[in-house]
C-alpha cells in the first residue's frame, strides 16, 4: 500500500504562546474610561479615567499630567473645585462614567457618578507632541438645575453612553442613560436625551428634548446602553433591554435606536431590533431552523469595510458596517454552539429597512395591527397614530413620532462559529489595505487580530497573544491613536499596533512570507520578524524548501527505493508539478531523480491542514557506502508563486544504505500445484520500498515482511524439477545460490 | 396613490445601449429601496438589480452584472436601469417596483426592450 | 446563487378547491425573506405574502405562507374565480435574488 506522507495540522506553522511586549501603563485603578485625541499639528494624548483620577498621557504612554475627580467633598478635588465652594452634594467616590472629545473646541468632557452626574470641560493645550487639560470648567448652574428638571445632570451611575456632534458652531451631546427608580429620582437623568452645550461653557441648554422609561416600567424594564456612534447624517445608540414590556425582563435582545444629527429632536427617534444567529452549514437534529439566536450584544463597533468582506456582504468597499459581538445570555454562558459571534450589518440597510418601517407605518392605506411601541417611553398606539392618541389630527404628522420598526435586522455569524469558547470583551474593527481586521479583546486578557471574512472555515489571525499575566477582562473601550489600539485591562493600558504585535508567532518561513503586507513580516534565516529585528539577513521573497519527514528510512546499498518525501515549500502550486531540473535531491553521496507526480493521486489538502509530497527514485551510485547519511532537497530556478518563490536546501539525517543478506531458506521443496509457504531468514529484508522471491523467474506471492525474515507462497510449477531461487531488493538480486525443488504433488 | 410609471424601452441592436426610468409617485420615494425585474416573452419574471434608499447598496443579477448599472434621483423621484452591451436574450418587459424587506408590494406596468438586429 | 424550485408546473383545480403550491430552495433562505407573488397575463405581479408568512395589506385572508429553511408553502384555502393565475416565489436575503420558474394554477 502507497506510504502517505501525515498530515501537518496548519496550527503547527504558528505559536500564541509566543509573548509579545508591548507598551503599557499601570494607572493604580481599574480603568473605567479612556479616550485619545491627535490633533492637527501633530500633538495627540491618551486620557485614563480611574476612580478619583484623570490621567494624561503622551502617545508614548507616559504621563502627562493628572488630575483628581474625586472623592466629591475632599478638598483635594480639583474638579470640584471648579463649581465654587461647596458643598455640591453628598459626598463620595467619583466613578468616570462618561469621557468624551468635544472635536469642535477641542476640549475633553468627563462626567462622573458623583455630584449628580454633572461633567466637567477640559480645554487640551498643546505643547510640543503633548496635550495638557485647561483648568475644568463646571458645566452645572445652580439655578437652573432641580430634582425634577436637570439639563447639567448628565452622567448616571448605572451606565451612560455620549456621542458629541457639531452642528453649526453649536456642540450637541447625544446622551443615553441607564435608569431605575432610584436615580430616576434623584436629579433626573433622562434616558435619551439631545444637549446642546453653552457657549459659556456654564452647563448644558435647558428645555432639552429628552425620552425615559416612564415611572411604571422603571422597577421591571431596565435598558443598557452598550455603544454610541455618529455616521453620516445619524446618531446610533446599541441597547441590550428586555423584548417586552410585559413579558419575561430576563429576556433580552438588542436594538439599535436611530437619531437624527443634523436635526436636535426626537421626533424621528427610531428602533429596530437586530438578530445575530449562529446558522452551522450543517444544521444539528433539533437546532432551530434559522439558526441558534444570540440576543444579547456585549460590544459593537462601526467601521468602513475592506474590498474582500465589501464583496462578501454585497456592498461597496469603504461602506460603514455596523459589527456586534452577541452571546447567547447575560452571563454569556456556554450553550450549544460558541461562546461569541459576530455578525456584521451594513448600515445603508439598516436605514434602509429603518425607512420602510416608517413608511409602512405612515402611508395609506393602513396596515392593520401595526404597533407604534416603545410602550416603555411612551403611550402604546397603533400606526399612523400618534402616542396615546386615537387618530392623528390635522397638524400632526405620523413620522414625528418615535417608533419601533416592527421587522427585525438578522444576520448570521460572520466566523461560523469558529470563536468557539472564546469570550470575546472588547471589538474595534479597521480597514488594512483590502482587509477588513477584527481586533478583538478577551476574557481572559488576550487579544486576536483576526481577518473578518465568511468563506472559510478557519480563523485567519493576524495574532493572538497574551497582554500581560494578569489574565484579567479585556474592557469594551477600545480607542485607536495613529496606528496603535488601545486596549484596557485591570488597572494597565496597553498600546497594541494595529497591524499586530510581531510576527514571531509565524513558525515557518511559508506561513511568515504569506502573512498581509501590511504585517511587515520576512524571514531571518530560521524565524520570522518584522526588519528591524533583524536587519541583516531578513528578505521576503523567498523560503528554503522544508523536509520533515521520509519513507522509508533504509535502502538497498544495491538497487532502487522510491523515496517519499515530506514537508512544506516543494512546489508552491497546488499541482505539484515541477519544472525540469528544478528539484535536485541527494542521499549521501547519490543522486534521487525525480518522479512525475501521479495525477491520479493527488488529494485536495483542506487548507487547515498542510503537507506536501516530493517523490524521487534512488539508485545508489558505486561509491555509496553503507550506513546512515542524509536526505537533501536543493530546489533553485523556481517560477515564483504568489507570495514567495522556493529557493535553497533542506537537510534532514536517519536514512540508511544497507545491504540485505539472505541466510536461511525452507522448505527447499514442495509440490509442483504451488502453494507451499517458503520462509526466507536473513537481515535488512524489509529495506527499500520494493523486494520480490522469484522461484524459476516467477513471483511467489508475499504473505509478510520484516527485517529478518519474508513469508511468501510458491507459484505452480511447470514440471517436477529444480528450479532457481532468488531474493530481488530494489530490483537487484540479494547475493546467493539457492534452489526449490517441485516434487508431484 | 402609489404609482410607477416606467419607459424608454423599445427596439435595440445587439450591443447597443439603452437607459430605463421609473418615475415614482404617491409615496416618499426617498424611504424606499426599488428594484428592477423582467419578464422575456412568455417566461418567467427574472430579478435584475437592487439600490437601496440612499443608493449606497447596489445588486445586480449575473446575468446582467458588468453591463447594467441600477441609479436613482431621490430628487426627481426616479429610478434608472442603464443597459449596455444588450444582447437578444436582453429582450424582455422590464419592470420597476418597490420595497425590500417587506416584499415588492408595488410594480410598474412594464416597459418592452427588444434587442434584435 | 440559492436556486428556487416550484412545484407542481401546473395545477388543475376548480373553484372553492385548495390549492398548494410548494417552492424548494437549494440552501437555507436564512430568517424567511421569501415572498410569493401572483401574475395574471397582460399584468404586472402583485404581492401576495412577504417574510414567508406575512400578508400583504390588501390580500385577502385566503392566502397563506408558510416554511422555514428550504422548504415553503403558498396555500390558498378555497380558490375563487380571480385567483388562477401564476404564482412565483421570491428570495431576497442572498444577492442575487432569485425567482422560482413560477406554478401556473388553471380551472379543471
Known amino acids: 500500500e502507497d506510504w502517505q506522507c501525515p498530515r501537518t495540522p496548519y496550527a503547527a506553522s504558528r505559536d500564541f504562546d509566543v509573548k509579545y511586549v508591548v507598551p503599557s501603563f499601570s494607572a493604580g485603578g481599574l480603568v473605567q474610561a479612556m479616550v485619545t485625541y491627535e490633533g492637527d499639528r501633530n500633538e495627540s494624548a491618551v486620557f485614563v479615567a480611574i476612580r478619583n483620577r484623570l490621567h494624561v498621557l503622551g502617545p508614548d504612554l507616559k504621563s502627562v499630567q493628572s488630575l483628581a475627580t474625586g472623592p466629591a467633598g475632599d478638598p483635594g478635588c480639583q474638579t470640584c473645585a471648579a463649581c465654587g465652594p461647596g458643598p455640591h452634594g453628598p459626598p463620595g467616590d467619583t466613578d468616570t462614567k462618561v469621557l468624551v472629545l468635544d472635536p469642535a473646541l477641542p476640549a475633553l468632557v468627563s462626567c462622573g457618578s458623583s455630584l449628580q452626574g454633572r461633567c466637567f470641560l477640559h480645554d487640551l493645550e498643546p505643547q510640543g507632541t503633548a496635550v495638557h487639560l485647561a483648568a475644568p470648567a463646571c458645566l452645572f448652574s445652580a439655578h437652573h438645575n432641580r430634582p425634577d428638571d436637570c439639563p447639567d445632570c448628565v452622567a448616571s451611575p448605572l451606565g451612560t453612553r455620549v456621542t458629541v456632534v457639531e452642528q453649526g458652531q453649536a456642540s450637541y451631546f447625544y446622551v443615553a442613560s441607564s435608569l431605575d427608580a432610584a436615580v430616576a429620582a434623584s436629579f433626573s437623568p433622562r434616558s435619551v436625551s439631545i444637549r446642546r452645550l453653552k457657549a459659556d461653557a456654564s452647563g448644558f441648554a435647558p428645555g432639552f428634548v429628552a425620552l425615559s422609561v416612564l415611572p411604571k416600567h422603571l422597577v421591571s424594564y431596565s435598558i443598557e446602553y452598550v455603544h454610541s456612534f455618529h455616521t453620516g447624517a445619524f446618531v446610533y445608540f446599541l441597547t441590550v433591554q428586555p423584548a417586552s414590556v410585559t413579558d419575561d425582563p430576563s429576556a433580552l435582545h438588542t436594538r439599535l435606536a436611530r437619531l437624527s444629527a443634523t436635526e436636535p429632536e426626537l421626533g424621528d427617534y427610531r428602533e429596530l431590533v437586530l438578530d445575530c444567529r449562529f446558522a452551522p452549514k450543517r444544521r444539528r437534529r433539533g437546532a432551530p431552523e434559522g439558526g441558534q439566536p444570540y440576543p444579547v450584544l456585549r460590544v459593537a463597533h462601526s467601521a468602513p469595510v475592506g474590498a474582500q468582506l465589501a464583496t462578501e456582504l454585497s456592498i461597496a468597499e469603504g461602506q460603514e458596517v455596523l459589527f456586534g459581538v452577541f452571546v447567547t445570555g447575560k452571563d454569556g454562558g456556554p450553550g450549544v454552539g460558541p461562546n461569541s459571534v459576530v455578525c456584521a450589518f451594513p448600515i445603508d440597510l439598516l436605514d434602509t429597512l429603518i425607512d420602510e418601517g416608517v413608511e409602512r407605518c405612515c402611508e395609506s392605506p393602513v396596515h392593520p395591527g401595526l404597533r407604534r411601541g416603545l410602550d416603555f417611553f411612551q403611550s402604546p398606539s397603533f400606526c399612523p397614530n400618534p402616542p396615546g392618541l386615537e387618530a392623528l389630527s390635522p397638524n400632526t404628522s405620523c413620522r414625528h413620532f418615535p417608533l419601533l420598526v416592527s421587522s427585525s435586522f438578522s444576520r448570521v455569524d460572520l466566523f461560523n462559529g469558529l470563536l468557539g469558547p472564546v469570550q470575546v470583551t472588547a471589538l474595534y474593527v479597521t480597514r488594512l489595505d483590502n482587509v477588513t481586521v477584527a481586533h478583538m479583546g478577551t476574557m481572559d486578557g488576550r487579544i486576536l487580530q483576526v481577518e473578518l471574512v465568511r468563506s472559510l472555515n478557519y480563523l485567519l489571525y493576524v495574532s493572538n497573544f497574551s497582554l500581560g499575566d494578569s489574565g484579567q477582562p479585556v474592557q469594551r473601550d477600545v480607542s485607536r491613536l495613529g496606528d496603535h489600539l488601545l486596549f484596557a485591562s485591570g488597572d494597565q493600558v496597553f498600546q497594541v499596533p494595529i497591524q499586530g504585535p510581531g510576527c514571531r508567532h509565524f513558525l515557518t518561513c511559508g506561513r511568515c512570507l504569506r502573512a498581509w503586507h501590511f504585517m511587515g513580516c520576512g524571514w531571518c534565516g530560521n524565524m520570522c520578524g518584522q526588519q528591524k529585528e533583524c536587519p541583516g539577513s531578513w528578505q521576503q521573497d523567498h523560503c528554503p524548501p522544508k523536509l520533515t519527514e521520509f519513507h522509508p528510512h533504509s535502502g538497498p546499498l544495491r538497487g532502487s527505493t522510491r523515496l517519499t518525501l515530506c514537508g512544506s515549500n516543494f512546489y508552491l502550486h497546488p499541482s505539484g508539478l515541477v519544472p525540469e531540473g528544478t528539484h535536485q535531491v541527494t542521499v549521501g553521496q547519490s543522486p534521487c531523480r525525480p518522479l512525475p507526480k501521479d495525477s491520479s493521486k493527488l488529494r485536495p489538502v483542506p487548507r487547515k491542514d498542510f503537507v506536501e509530497e516530493f517523490e524521487c527514485e534512488l539508485e545508489p551510485l558505486g561509491t555509496q557506502a553503507v550506513g546512515p547519511t542524509n536526505v537533501s532537497l536543493t530546489v533553485t530556478n523556481m517560477p515564483p508563486g504568489k507570495h514567495f518563490r522556493v529557493d535553497g536546501t533542506s537537510v534532514l539525517r536517519g536514512f540508511s544504505f544497507m545491504e540485505p543478506v539472505l541466510i536461511a531458506v525452507q522448505p527447499l521443496f514442495g509440490p509442483r500445484a504451488g502453494g507451499t509457504c517458503l520462509t526466507l531468514e536473513g537481515q535488512s529484508l524489509s529495506v527499500g520500498t520494493s523486494r520480490a522471491v522469484l522461484v524459476n523467474g516467477t513471483e511467489c506471492l508475499l504473505a509478510r515482511v520484516s527485517e529478518g525474515q519474508l513469508l511468501c507462497a510458491t507459484p505452480p510449477g511447470a514440471t517436477v524439477a529444480s528450479v532457481p531461487l532468488s531474493l530481488q531488493v530494489g530490483g537487484a538480486q540479494v547475493p546467493g545460490s539457492w534452489t526449490f525443488q517441485y516434487r508431484e504433488d | 396613490q402609489v404609482q410607477l410609471v416606467e419607459s424608454g424601452g423599445g427596439l435595440v441592436q445587439p450591443g447597443g445601449s439603452l437607459r430605463l426610468s421609473c418615475a415614482a409617485s404617491?409615496?416618499?420615494?426617498?424611504?424606499?429601496?426599488m428594484s428592477w425585474v423582467r419578464q422575456a416573452p412568455g417566461k418567467g419574471l427574472e430579478w435584475v438589480s437592487y439600490?437601496?434608499?440612499?443608493?449606497?447598496?447596489?445588486y445586480y443579477a449575473d446575468s446582467v452584472k458588468g453591463r447594467f448599472t441600477i441609479s436613482r434621483d431621490n430628487s426627481k423621484n426616479t429610478l434608472y436601469l442603464q443597459m449596455n452591451s444588450l444582447r437578444a436574450e436582453d429582450t424582455a418587459v422590464y419592470y420597476c417596483?418597490?420595497?425590500?424587506?417587506?416584499?415588492?408590494?408595488?410594480w410598474g406596468q412594464g416597459t418592452l426592450v427588444t434587442v434584435s438586429s | 446563487d440559492i436556486v428556487l424550485t416550484q412545484s407542481p408546473a401546473t395545477l388543475s383545480l376548480s373553484p372553492g378547491e385548495r390549492a398548494t403550491l410548494s417552492c424548494r430552495a437549494s440552501q437555507s433562505v436564512s430568517f424567511d425573506y421569501l415572498g410569493w407573488y401572483q401574475q395574471k397575463p397582460g399584468q404586472a405581479p402583485r404581492l401576495l405574502i412577504y417574510g414567508a408568512s406575512n400578508r400583504a395589506t390588501g390580500v385577502p385572508a385566503r392566502f397563506s405562507g408558510s416554511g422555514s429553511g428550504t422548504d415553503f408553502t403558498l396555500t390558498i384555502s378555497s380558490l375563487e374565480p380571480e385567483d388562477f393565475a401564476t404564482y412565483y416565489c421570491?428570495?431576497?436575503?442572498?444577492?442575487?435574488?432569485?425567482f422560482g420558474q413560477g406554478t401556473k394554477v388553471e380551472i379543471k
Open positions: 417596483a418597490r420595497g425590500y424587506f417587506h416584499g415588492m408590494d408595488y
Open positions: 421570491l428570495q431576497y436575503f442572498n444577492p442575487p435574488h432569485t
Open positions: 439600490i437601496s434608499s440612499r443608493s449606497s447598496t447596489t
Open positions: 404617491g409615496f416618499t420615494f426617498n424611504s424606499y429601496s
